[in-house]
């Protein structure tokens, strides 16, 4: 049998980091045996079979130069075999980011922090935290780990599928190459990583017979389920063309009135959505919908100073107009569990006002 | 020999935008970890943001989280930071910083000076 | 976030001098912690790495020591380039942090 180890990686290859000593091994012979070592297509000696070293060669410092495939030979002139030489550096730990579009599943993708030059591979891996009681901070013993599974296609991610909204989990994403592992763990409870995708179907039509109103409406993210549990609460913003700065108002309900639109001039509208009891963050704006006030007949209207920068239609649908009901009682405390980061969104979105 | 030069850096009105900028040399930029650190006058090191390699996933601290963006160019070798809705309390020196091998910020750059004042 | 205490806030010292820095973290970091000197003017340089690992080119006076919440970082015998202000900082989180810093001044 060889005397070489097989580290993970195509066959034939050994690797080494760039400015350390590297060891190459002679694969076709037995540990110790006196080898000849050459440079592909070079017929210089580069290490004789007298060098005390056996079956290896020593590189000392090695550089981008040293690259390449080396030879072997024993004694008697036969191929000890063929070694191609890669340098690179060990795994640094790799950066992880989780996020979730709602509040049964979450995704976590990661990114080495530096690109080690070697073929690579990642373990993915969870467990899941639950907490004893709603003021106790021990934990259960952990129950995982199971594996995170990977995306198919090879995009670096991985997807955890009926989480649960109250505990928490630690995730581990080890980055391997041939040189070493190295691991980040990190403690996420979907609570802080919930993100919802943005609402959809937003239209704004025009209210006739009154020249300063809007009416917008828009649904839930098609992957929200709804439940009684688990609503979402709505911010939208609207603008007159031309005009740099948004207003805001938060809607009760699917739609919202706008009172206090510009006569005659074409309005942008977007929305965003949230839990509606603040868990993670609001959701990115919808894309922008267009309206124009009515100019038809007029209406009475009451002041706009009075009301505001809007009003909800009376008919709301019930379940979105009356008090949304209380999520369970017994719920852990809030604060994190340790101190793993709280992970980041991918992108950050700027809200001008 | 890793060096790390920031520029953009001036004086800007509250709520103002200042893109700050590091040209890398010295080391494969494309392979390595980025990030900002600053320093407000009379107090210490801040952590600021940092990017991963490829640019996919970029982390903030809280301070300047939706304000600020950190990016990268690769083919130029040089990392930014759009700095927007600026504040009082973001003048500082901001430098430029590599990571290595999991370690954060072992190279900085010398630092350029941000100071938001009307 | 973790937060990074140091002590003392500022010492004085004589060249020739052994000196002993403390940091603690607010949580467990295991040993992610760096210590830098920052001079006034200059970029800040990194000492040690992984808590007790020398960076490459700093003289052996200086050493790091200590893993989980508490660390120590000393200076073996001060000299007048030792002088400036050394921060600890953690990366065990993807959030690093520094500590408040130790200015180090001439007695």
């Known amino acids: 049998s060889s005397p070489c180890p097989q580290a993970w990686g195509p066959p034939g290859v050994q690797y080494g980091q760039p400015g350390r000593s590297v060891k190459l091994c002679c694969p076709g012979v037995t540990a110790g045996d006196p080898v000849s070592w050459f440079r592909d297509g070079e017929p210089k000696l580069l290490q004789g079979p007298d060098s005390g070293l056996g079956h290896e060669l020593v590189l000392a410092q090695a550089d981008s130069t040293d690259e390449g495939t080396y030879i072997c030979q024993t004694l008697d002139g036969a191929l000890g075999g063929t070694v191609t030489l890669q340098l690179g550096y060990p795994p640094a730990r790799p950066v992880v980011s989780c996020q979730a579009a709602d509040y049964e599943n979450f995704s976590c993708t990661w990114s080495p922090s530096q690109i080690s030059g070697l073929p690579t591979r990642y373990l993915t891996s969870y467990r899941k935290k639950t907490v004893l009681g709603a003021d106790s901070q021990r934990r259960s013993p952990s129950t995982g780990p199971w594996p995170c599974p990977q995306d198919p296609l090879g995009a670096a991610r991985c997807v955890v599928h009926g989480a649960e909204f109250w505990s928490q989990y630690r995730i581990n994403v080890t980055e391997v190459n041939p040189l070493g592992a190295s691991t980040r763990l990190l403690d996420v409870s979907l609570q802080s990583i919930l993100r919802p995708d943005p609402p959809q179907g937003l239209r704004v039509e025009s209210v006739p017979g009154y020249p300063r109103r809007l009416h917008a409406s828009w649904t839930y993210p098609a992957s929200w389920r709804r439940q009684p549990h688990f609503l979402l609460k709505f911010r939208l913003q609207y603008r007159p063309a031309q005009h740099p700065a948004w207003s805001t108002v938060e809607p009760i309900g699917l739609e919202e009135v706008i009172t206090d639109a510009v006569a005659g001039l074409p309005h942008a509208v977007r929305v965003s959505a949230r839990d509606f009891l603040d868990a993670g963050t609001w959701s990115a704006w919808s894309p922008e919908a267009w309206g124009t006030p009515s100019t038809g007949p007029l209406q009475d209207e009451i002041p706009d100073w009075s009301q505001g920068h809007g009003q909800q239609l009376e008919a709301v649908v019930a379940q979105e107009d009356s008090p949304a009901p209380a999520r369970p009682s017994l719920q852990p405390d809030p604060r994190p569990l340790d101190h793993r980061d709280p992970l980041e969104q991918h992108h950050h979105h700027h809200h001008h006002h | 020999e890793v060096q790390l030069l920031e520029s953009g850096g001036g004086l800007v009105q509250p709520g103002g935008s200042l893109r700050l900028s590091c040209a890398a040399s010295?080391?494969?930029?494309?392979?390595?970890?980025m990030g900002w650190v600053r320093q407000a006058p009379g107090k210490g090191l801040e952590w600021v943001s940092s990017?991963?390699?490829?640019?996919?996933?970029?982390i903030y601290a809280d301070s300047v989280k939706g304000r600020f963006t950190i990016s990268r160019d690769n083919s130029k070798n040089t990392l930014y930071l759009q700095m927007n809705s600026l504040r009082a309390e973001d003048t500082a020196v901001y430098y430029c910083?590599?990571?290595?091998?999991?370690?954060?910020?072992?190279?900085w750059g010398q630092g350029t000076l941000v100071t938001v004042s009307s | 976030d973790i937060q990074m205490t140091q002590s003392p806030s500022s010492l004085s010292a004589s060249v020739g001098d052994r000196v002993t820095i403390t940091c603690q973290a607010s949580?467990?970091?295991?040993?992610?912690l760096n210590w830098y000197l920052h001079k006034p003017g200059k970029a800040p340089k990194l000492l040690i790495y992984?808590?007790?690992n020398l960076q490459t080119g700093v003289p052996s006076r200086f050493s790091g020591s200590g893993s989980g919440t508490d660390f120590t970082f000393t200076i073996t015998s001060l000299q007048p380039e030792d002088f400036g202000t050394y921060y600890c900082?953690?990366?065990?989180?993807?959030?690093?942090?520094f500590g408040p810093g130790t200015t180090v001044d001439i007695k």
């Open positions: 990017i991963v390699p490829s640019g996919g996933i970029t």
């Open positions: 910083a590599r990571d290595h091998m999991g370690i954060v910020a072992t190279d």
């Open positions: 949580q467990d970091i295991t040993n992610y």
């Open positions: 900082q953690q990366y065990d989180t993807l959030h690093p942090s």
């Open positions: 010295g080391f494969t930029f494309s392979r390595y970890m």
């Open positions: 992984d808590a007790s």
